[in-house]
């Protein structure tokens, strides 16, 4: 007996071939001997089966001696043995229909779980193997679960169902809802405008929800809400914003915030949360602000940084085109009695400059100029 595997919702063609290459009489029946369809000359005749409106054949193949049974919009319950009667012969085909569905929404938040459920006909014993977009394989029986979804799990999951040495492949598109970056850091000189961007790692037709940016300034004892906003069909509207700092927010995606001035009192880290409509849980992105200030007070040239810096970052003061006068893994460095000229304060990581501030030291009778 020939075995054919089908996918729920798909179309399947069960073949039946006569030895004569011409149109002759044929009939398709199910295991209960109920007639599904057959021919009478050029015409199709249909029986009282439950397949009536979904069963068909292909007239253009009859003259080739091929009399297929085509079943559209397959259902699990179409799984059966189908018998083709042609030329006093009987051809049996066993059809097994499988379905694979994500038992929750296919749009899941980062960190959530994905469960795939296999629908299979009674008496079948299939095995399932799924391959994630990042190449991770998972195996199981009727259900497969993946916990702690990551951004790289977004994309097409390919699942293969094996039964009777035959296989059928399912493709399920999973969208992991997350920000493109879990964390970002912005380095700014004091007084500069600060741009914070929170690009999403997914695109959907309509995006509705609400969000908030909480900020923990390095100098402050507790965090405070800087801004709250709504998102409706990808349009952003600000609900509430603090007076200090007075943040501005872009009206379109990606989420974009502007801090008019980088000041030491704003240096610190923030957490932007986004709650999406009809989703449990929130999306998070951490953002950090490091602010640099270079000053000269009397005979002391000082460079300071505020905000979350890693211990391996190096802060240096150097006269332009000369070796660093001072270089420390600290948040403040200074030079006493600096020579006249253009001094550079540099914050660097393994030789790569992250932030630079220049200050002009004038001969001792003048006051310093900050370019």
């Amino acid at each position: 007996k020939k075995v054919v595997l089908g996918k729920k919702g798909d179309t399947v063609e069960l073949t039946c071939t006569a030895s004569q290459k011409k149109s002759i009489q044929f009939h398709w029946k199910n295991s209960n001997q109920i007639k599904i369809l057959g021919n009478q000359g050029s015409f199709l005749t249909k029986g009282p089966s439950k397949l009536n409106d979904r069963a068909d054949s292909r007239r253009s193949l009859w003259d080739q001696g091929n009399f297929p049974l085509i079943i559209k919009n397959l259902k699990i319950e179409d799984s059966d043995t189908y018998i083709c009667e042609v030329e006093d012969q009987k051809e049996e085909v066993q059809l097994l229909v499988f379905g694979l569905t994500a038992n929750s929404d296919t749009h899941l938040l980062q960190g959530q779980s994905l469960t795939l459920t296999l629908e299979s006909p009674p008496g079948s014993s299939p095995s399932v193997q799924c391959r994630s977009p990042r190449g991770k394989n998972i195996q199981g029986g009727k259900t497969l679960s993946v916990s702690q979804l990551e951004l790289q799990d977004s994309g097409t999951w390919t699942c293969t169902v094996l039964q009777n040495q035959k296989k059928v492949e399912f493709k399920i598109d999973i969208v992991v809802l997350a920000f493109q970056k879990a964390s970002s850091i912005v380095y700014k000189k004091e007084g500069e405008q600060v741009e914070f961007s929170f690009p999403l790692a997914f695109t959907v037709e309509k995006l509705t929800g609400s969000g908030e940016l909480w900020w923990q300034a390095e100098r402050a004892s507790s965090s405070k809400s800087w801004i709250t906003f709504d998102l409706k069909n990808k349009e952003v509207s600000v609900k509430r914003v603090t007076q200090d700092p007075k943040l501005q927010m872009g009206k379109k995606l990606p989420l974009h915030l502007t801090l008019p001035q980088a000041l030491p009192q704003y240096a610190g880290s923030g957490n932007l949360t986004l709650a999406l409509e009809a989703k449990t849980g929130k999306l998070h992105q951490e953002v950090n602000l490091v602010v640099m200030r270079a000053t000269q007070l009397q005979k002391n040239l000082t460079c300071e940084v505020w905000g979350p810096t890693s211990p391996k970052l190096m802060l240096s003061l150097k006269l332009e085109n000369k070796e660093a006068k001072v270089s420390k893994r600290e948040k403040a460095v200074w030079v006493l009695n600096p020579e006249a000229g253009m001094w550079q304060c540099l914050l660097s990581d393994s030789g790569q400059v992250l932030l630079e501030s220049n200050i002009k030291v004038l001969p001792t009778w003048s006051t310093p100029v900050q370019p």
Partner: antibody, heavy 126, light 107 residues
Framework: EVQLLESGGGLVQPGGSLRLSCAAS????????TSWVRQAPGKGLEWVAV????????YYADSVKGRFTISRDNSKNTLYLQMNSLRAEDTAVYYC???????????????????WGQGTTVTVSS | DIQMTQSPSSLSASVGDRVTITCRAS??????LNWYQQKPGKAPKLLIY???SLHSGVPSRFSGSGSGTDFTLTISSLQPEDFATYYC?????????FGGGTKVEIK
Amino acid sequence: EVQLLESGGGLVQPGGSLRLSCAASGFTFSNHYTSWVRQAPGKGLEWVAVISYDGSNKYYADSVKGRFTISRDNSKNTLYLQMNSLRAEDTAVYYCAREEKYSSSWYVGVDAFDIWGQGTTVTVSS
Amino acid sequence: DIQMTQSPSSLSASVGDRVTITCRASQSISTYLNWYQQKPGKAPKLLIYAASSLHSGVPSRFSGSGSGTDFTLTISSLQPEDFATYYCQQSYSTPLTFGGGTKVEIK
């Protein structure tokens, strides 16, 4: 948007080979028989080959039998036409076309080409 | 193989005219007949399937009739966008075959 997009055409010498591809999008590719139809310059339409849903059944026009092979990769939503031993008379625009089955309760569904690609030009010349 | 013969091979008509194109099959094909429209440099478009059923999106000025061996495509009132070549095609038997085409030109 439901569409078919052919590629792979070009200039080839008689006796040479060419492989055409047709990328399907916007519909369940595996639920349709798919054909190649060609049109020689200034001439009418000529059906070339057809392939069944899963690729197990293939039928060809006598003019290409034994030289052309139709195949499909449902996982990639792509139809192919491998053309070998090309002749000058194979010069044409090659279209891939989706077949839709228009059924009724009393007759076998009529198959018609409801979606066509934009065509890819094959020129066989020395 | 089933031969499909279209007539006329070309015709000249004016906007607003009623146009009739015929297609004859070399053997009975019941109603396994489709009609297509093709404009220069473009792919064909399905107009009518199963001899008389209008494909979705096709204007109602197009109609088809016939059964067995003789079929007709009628354009009740020719519009400027209807100047094109029209093909019939049978899906009764493999190989699938097309008629030679009828070119409808502006008079």
